[in-house]
Amino acid sequence: ECVTQLLKDTCFEGGDITTVFTPSAKYCQVVCTYHPRCLLFTFTAESPSEDPTRWFTCVLKDSVTETLPRVNRTAAISGYSFKQCSHQISACNKDIYVDLDMKGINYNSSVAKSAQECQERCTDDVHCHFFTYATRQFPSLEHRNICLLKHTQTGTPTRITKLDKVVSGFSLKSCALSNLACIRDIFPNTVFADSNIDSVMAPDAFVCGRICTHHPGCLFFTFFSQEWPKESQRNLCLLKTSESGLPSTRIKKSKALSGFSLQSCRHSIPVFCHSSFYHDTDFLGEELDIVAAKSHEACQKLCTNAVRCQFFTYTPAQASCNEGKGKCYLKLSSNGSPTKILHGRGGISGYTLRLCKMDNECTTKIKPRIVGGTASVRGEWPWQVTLHTTSPTQRHLCGGSIIGNQWILTAAHCFYGVESPKILRVYSGILNQSEIKEDTSFFGVQEIIIHDQYKMAESGYDIALLKLETTVNYTDSQRPICLPSKGDRNVIYTDCWVTGWGYRKLRDKIQNTLQKAKIPLVTNEECQKRYRGHKITHKMICAGYREGGKDACKGDSGGPLSCKHNEVWHLVGITSWGEGCAQRERPGVYTNVVEYVDWILEKTQAV
């Protein structure tokens, strides 16, 4: 059962796993949610009746029954983890805590103009977990405007104390706001020879990389595969760090793989969700339950639905036994990973999918695309919406993309002459315009947010957000697309598609069926040569064939330029302007979404 509200002046008795320090009960709940075993917590707020050494303590708790006895205690705030909830979860914490000093290892001290600048510095520093900033009013003159960057083994403070005229806060890496590079490559036959901060068992290098990503101290990793010569180290995932933030030595070793934390790209790839099945593989751990199941998929479902289950092993039924049902072993461990991994015993193992909700919904794999042809099929581009105006008569106005359950990203130039959001309708999950009838359900638009620097499409800033009146329930035919990570600025996308119901050639009419075209990206330098009378800025991105023929066209404005990278679709561009329908063989010009990620997050996360 999902319980989101906090219980004031209440303490849960027993079940302690560990104690951490957090600046608020709300953040204690987040820490509990992300901890592999925590189901409940008790936080102690500052209070005259409470011992100051216990202020800001966050006790993480577990219980076989998923609940614990409650005791009344002033200043105690208790609650449940969000593990039991189905809604999207984020570790992003933008709060600034006034007059609190969050203790940790102060590894960097510098002058900053503001707390915001200090927070940005922390976000863009590979080691930083949180910071404390001494304001202009701080009593000690030499410490004023000092920004202390801090880290700890757990990523949370080692202590929190009251201190006048300072402010503290966390790195915004988990808010997708870091400018640090996103290095997705996994290097085969490579060992990073740096200090290990932890080690866990993992079935493959991808899981190892994802574990590294959500481990607070891990910057890179080395994984020893099941063919590794030393038996005791097979399937071992070594989580590593270094002072420089990069591996100091790379050693060539067969059957080992190494890679980097994906902290700077975690909003656009799954880092918690280990969805694969591992055949002829047994995961060992503490046994939670043994249940009969028809298949390994059914076993995974059982594990996902059991809140304490972290991983499972399924042993298929022996012929005609138990109505063809096999045994499903639901398991857990102290760190969420198997204590040992064995091969050759015939089991099929995997992980709970409960953690998938900690990843962005946009990272979910969609059904395979139909290659070739120009007409799309249902569910192929589930983020694509058709934006209609009802004035003077109802018609398709522009395309757009679902980026959140209440947010559509589109082009600013679509709203020329649109006086009010009341005349707009957003239709999602649509393949053919002819499906839209009087009684077709739509989303009303609560607010149009146009970039305040927008003047005309050709000058840039051609970006707008639509806040919907109601939320979108994600299904196979309507779900969000990932925004590109700022750390992905240097990625070269090779699988890009433009979609929309726009005209296929000049003076054509709107198409009934959603059209698609695969188009290559063109460098801005090349694009500038083709548009000599217009400035192609770094906030624009160009795409289109040299020989013409395939391009976005009028009516596709505001729609997505979607690029697939590492099996995840990213909204790389918004159809903005260009020579029109490829007749002059010019590339189309798109709003370069990665340059507006901060703006999008600022607008969509505003309280």
């Epitope: 400035k535 020989e547 013409g548 020579e579 002059r584």
Partner: antibody, heavy 120, light 107 residues
Framework: QVQLQQSGAELVRPGTSVTVSCKAS????????IEWVNQRPGQGLEWIGV????????NYNENFKDKATLTADTSSSTAYMQLSSLTSDDSAVYFC?????????????WGQGTSVTVSS | DIVMTQTPKFLLVSAGDRVTITCKAS??????VAWYQQKPGQSPKLLIY???NRYTGVPDRFTGSGYGTDFTFTINTVQAEDLAVYFC?????????FGGGTKLEIK
């Protein structure tokens, strides 16, 4: 109908500057690019640069970067080209032209040309 | 910069003849080629754009063809008023560049 009316012929001294104007009429001035092209006596055509009157954006041929400055005044629908530090090499007929498409393309209307002679 | 090499430089023809001028680009310019006519003492006039599209009011004796790097401009039945210099121009990549011109003279 579309017309581009250029200023009259100029006889100027070396080292000085000259400004050639090009007044547009018969169309929406801000919606089309204005190009400048020169033609030295008995020679071919050479592109100098372009101005987008709608945005004020200019783009120059490398050979004319330090020679020509393009501006446009949308209120009077007039484009200007200033040529500086003139030498006898700059003696030529200078044309303004409108592009056929909003984003560039062939030049469909031309001014009558302005002859600039640099002589001491 | 893309170089447009135009041949021949001069053409001496009789009225009624068929005239062909060629233009070769130093790299592919796709379909972005235009042809202009410049009569003595006048400014250039656009005849053909996008290789083969005749501009408004241009007689159908003027035609263009080609693609990529090789382009041809043809006057099917030359008339006395066609005495002029003809230029090709690429508009594919900035800076736009012109061919050296072909001077057409009538015998």
């Amino acid at each position: 109908q579309v017309q581009l009316q250029q200023s009259g012929a100029e006889l100027v001294r070396p080292g000085t500057s000259v400004t050639v104007s090009c007044k547009a009429s018969g169309y929406a001035f801000s919606n089309y690019l204005i190009e400048w092209v020169n033609q030295r006596p008995g020679q071919g055509l050479e592109w100098i640069g372009v101005i987008n009157p709608g945005s004020g954006y200019t783009n120059y041929n490398e050979n004319f970067k330090d020679k020509a400055t393009l501006t446009a005044d949308t209120s009077s629908s007039t484009a200007y080209m200033q040529l500086s530090s003139l030498t006898s090499d700059d003696s030529a007929v200078y044309f303004c032209a409108r592009t056929y498409g909003k984003y560039g393309g062939a030049m469909d209307f031309w001014g009558q040309g302005t002859s600039v002679t640099v002589s001491s | 910069d893309i170089v447009m090499t135009q041949t021949p430089k001069f053409l001496l023809v009789s009225a009624g003849d068929r005239v062909t001028i060629t233009c070769k680009a130093s790299q592919s310019v796709s379909n972005d080629v235009a042809w202009y006519q410049q009569k003595p003492g006048q400014s250039p006039k656009l005849l053909i754009y996008y290789i083969s599209n005749r501009y408004t009011g241009v007689p159908d004796r003027f035609t263009g063809s080609g693609y990529g790097t090789d382009f041809t401009f043809t006057i099917n039945t030359v008339q006395a008023e066609d005495l002029a210099v003809y230029f090709c121009q690429q508009d594919y990549s900035s800076p736009p560049t012109f061919g050296g011109g072909t001077k057409l003279e009538i015998k």
